[in-house]
């Protein structure tokens, strides 16, 4: 288990012709906030991905406005760190993507506007534990500058987090293989990944999996003394063959510790040491909040900045999964109307519509009008011999006979009302609370309460439903 | 804070179309339905129609759909109501709201129709 | 369309004593949504229509807590557990669920 962590030094125009215009003005004022993805390996992959290695958000950064005339110079930055814990071994390849995100202040009903400013995304080898590596990057006409360096957490050492640290068995020596842990020379290392539950005191490995014993001990896990000398903590009946007390199942046989937590014993029961982002007896809480970024794909993230609330992730449109880590197939829920033909361009769904049809689903039918009835309020549209029925809102189809509704998945939050049309669905928010989807509650001081992670779109757009 | 202000009082002559407006001031019409109401002398409240402006589609009550005509501008945070046809009867206070919840309503617009 | 009946249609009232006015649409207002939008108005003389309670129960803000709303489905209730000479004024129930909107015919509210 370890840490990445990325210091963000300076963002704004790059050298040469073309510089770009400041993101904010004296009308929209506005501040910069950070992502990182994470994810493992050289390959090249979609920015749509699963951040598998992680993610983080920065905090906000200070309130910027242009000064009229003068040249946009290198935006404030948020203080501090951005941090990407990882739970596994440090993968010493990796692939990232640095989003800068703008935040407009402007006085809008649906409360801040966020926008992507600039992607730069490269690939690295990086061991863990050692110096900063600097780089810069540029996103058209905008240049980042940034460090970043992998370390491991305690009590995790080496180039890939992947051997542990622990107190001496022994005053004078480490167990069999195992080497005296630099810098921390009262400890000794060994490998993270043994064998679930091996004995922390009487067993070790040198192999992923394995549990190898300490002189004395026997058993898969190590647990089991082998001669009357070695009865070094009964607790189990005696055992005729050996005249001493063989142990029963401790308490940490079997590891109860869920996701990579360290198990030890405690006089009534066990103790599970979790790692970063758990909590729990077992380790089985996702102690992760909004604040760690756990939202891929553009997700909004809802919840808690504290670590006993949970967080939910808003996915937006062709994302799925706890954590919108999954792309949706948009196109086998067959929205293309009248035998047209379904194209996802990732960014949007397009329908190719067979001759004699038309719209964004294909579902006008381009013939005349005359006799021809919109049912539900609908009314019929010509235009050159051909005609189509402009729907009422929550109705659809080519008579405007099918309800369509969307909000029957109650998209809005906190009370908010939700209309539907077929070019998407919008929420107006009860008072109290605005943005998209009414997640945020409006603060007595006008302020809003804003969400830990950078939404797709901005507050009050259509939101897509297929 | 977010405020409808609509257009003067109008004096119409029977037969001629009016043309009210309500302006969002201090935000934008967004995702709400702006209502139209109307209030004839001494009389309740009468739903018009309304529109969400980010969708530009409007609905109206089967009373007004033949004579009544909602429209939005979102680049000015504007919405208009056209009322044709008049008659003595469509004197009344013309209010705009913030729907579904009510919550903004604007000063009203006395349209009489007098010839 | 949903009508939406109202009684009283008048209700005088005495200072200090508690008011209830009963709104019933001619369906339910419950949206897929799951929210139901039934909003009550007040509408002092003179002024233009102010938004009391929304969604059945929750009370806007700035109003007074003697006003509270109840009710669900199709029948609905608003209180003023102590009427006060500020409150005189026309009551409606509206409710938002469905298009078109409608109005009940409003709730005269008088001092006895």
């Known amino acids: 288990a370890g840490v990445f962590e990325l210091q963000i030094h300076s963002f704004g125009p790059g050298p040469g012709p073309g510089a770009p215009r400041s993101p904010c003005s004296a009308r929209l004022p506005c501040r910069l906030f950070f992502r990182v993805c994470l994810k493992p390996g050289l390959s090249e992959e979609a920015a749509e991905s699963p951040c598998a290695l992680g993610a983080a958000l920065s905090a906000r950064g200070p309130v910027y406005t242009e000064q009229p005339g003068a040249p946009a110079p290198d935006l404030p930055l948020p203080d501090g760190l951005l941090q990407v814990p990882f739970r596994d071994a440090w993968p010493g390849t990796f692939s990232f993507i640095i989003e800068t995100w703008r935040e407009e202040l402007g006085d809008q009903i649906g409360g801040p506007a966020w926008s992507l400013l600039a992607r730069v995304a490269g690939r690295r080898r990086l061991a863990a534990g050692g110096p900063w590596a600097r780089d810069i990057q540029r996103a058209g006409a905008w240049e980042l500058r940034f460090s970043y360096r992998a370390r491991c957490e305690p009590p995790a050492v080496g180039t890939a987090c992947t051997r542990l640290c622990r107190p001496r068995s022994a005053p004078s020596r480490c167990g069999p293989g195992l080497r005296p842990c630099a810098p921390l020379e009262d400890e000794c290392e060994a490998p993270l990944v043994c064998r679930a539950g091996c004995s922390p005191e009487h067993g070790f490995c040198e192999q992923p999996g394995e549990c190898r014993c300490l002189e004395g001990w026997t058993g898969p896990l190590c647990t089991v003394p082998v001669s009357t000398s070695s009865c070094l903590s009964p607790r189990g009946p005696s055992s005729a063959t050996t005249g001493c007390l063989v142990p029963g199942p401790g308490p940490c046989d079997g590891n109860p510790c869920a996701n990579g937590g360290s198990c030890s014993e405690t006089p009534r029961s066990f103790e599970c040491t979790c790692p970063r982002g758990f909590y729990g007896l077992r380790c089985e809480v996702s102690g992760v909040t909004c604040a760690d970024g756990p939202c891929f794909n553009g997700g909004l993230c809802v919840g808690g900045a504290d670590p006993d609330s949970a967080y939910i992730c808003h996915c937006p449109p062709g994302f799925q999964g706890s954590n919108c880590e999954k792309r949706v197939d948009r196109c086998s829920l067959q929205p293309c109307r009248n035998g047209g033909l379904c194209l996802d361009l990732g960014h949007a769904l397009r329908c190719r519509c067979r001759a004699g049809f038309a719209g964004p689903r294909c579902e006008h039918d381009l013939d005349d009008c005359a006799g021809r009835a919109c049912a539900n309020g609908g009314t019929c549209v010509e235009g050159g011999g051909a005609h189509r029925c402009s729907c009422a809102l929550g109705f659809g189809g080519r008579d405007c006979r099918e309800r369509a509704d969307p909000c029957a998945a109650r998209p809005c939050a906190h009370g908010g009302r939700c209309y539907a049309h077929f070019s998407g669905l919008v929420c107006a928010c009860a008072p109290g609370y605005m943005g998209a989807r009414c997640e945020f509650p409006v603060h007595p001081d006008g302020a809003s309460a804003l969400p830990a992670a950078p939404p797709g779109l901005r507050p009050g757009d259509p939101q897509r439903y297929l | 804070q977010v405020q409808l202000v609509q257009s003067g009082a109008e004096v119409k002559k029977p037969g001629s179309s009016v043309k009210v407006s309500c302006k969002a001031s201090g935000g934008t019409l967004s995702s709400y339905v702006i209502s139209w109401v109307r209030q004839a002398p001494g009389q309740g409240l009468e739903w018009m129609g309304g529109?969400?402006?980010?969708?530009?589609?409007?609905n109206y009550a089967q009373k007004f759909q033949d004579r009544v005509t909602i429209t939005a501008d979102k680049s000015t945070n504007t919405a208009y109501m056209e009322l044709t046809s008049l008659t003595s009867e469509d004197t009344a206070v013309y209010y705009c709201?913030?729907?579904?919840?009510?919550?903004?309503w604007g000063r009203g617009t006395m349209v009489t129709v007098s010839s | 369309d949903i009508v939406m009946t109202q009684s009283p249609l008048s209700s005088p009232v005495t200072l200090g004593q508690p008011a209830s006015i009963s709104c019933r649409s001619s369906?339910?207002?419950?949206?897929?949504?799951?929210?139901?939008?039934l909003n009550w108005l007040q509408q002092r003389p003179g002024q233009p229509p102010r938004l009391l309670i929304y969604q059945i129960s929750n009370p806007f803000s700035g109003v007074p807590d003697r006003f509270s709303g109840s009710g669900a489905g199709t029948d609905f209730t608003l209180k003023i557990s102590r009427v006060e000479a500020e409150d005189v004024g026309v009551y409606y129930c509206m409710q938002a669920t469905q298009f078109p909107h409608t109005f009940g015919p409003g709730t005269k509210v008088e001092i006895k």
């Open positions: 369906q339910s207002l419950v949206h897929s949504d799951g929210n139901t939008y």
């Open positions: 529109i969400i402006p980010i969708f530009g589609t409007a």
């Open positions: 709201a913030r729907d579904p919840f009510s919550d903004l």
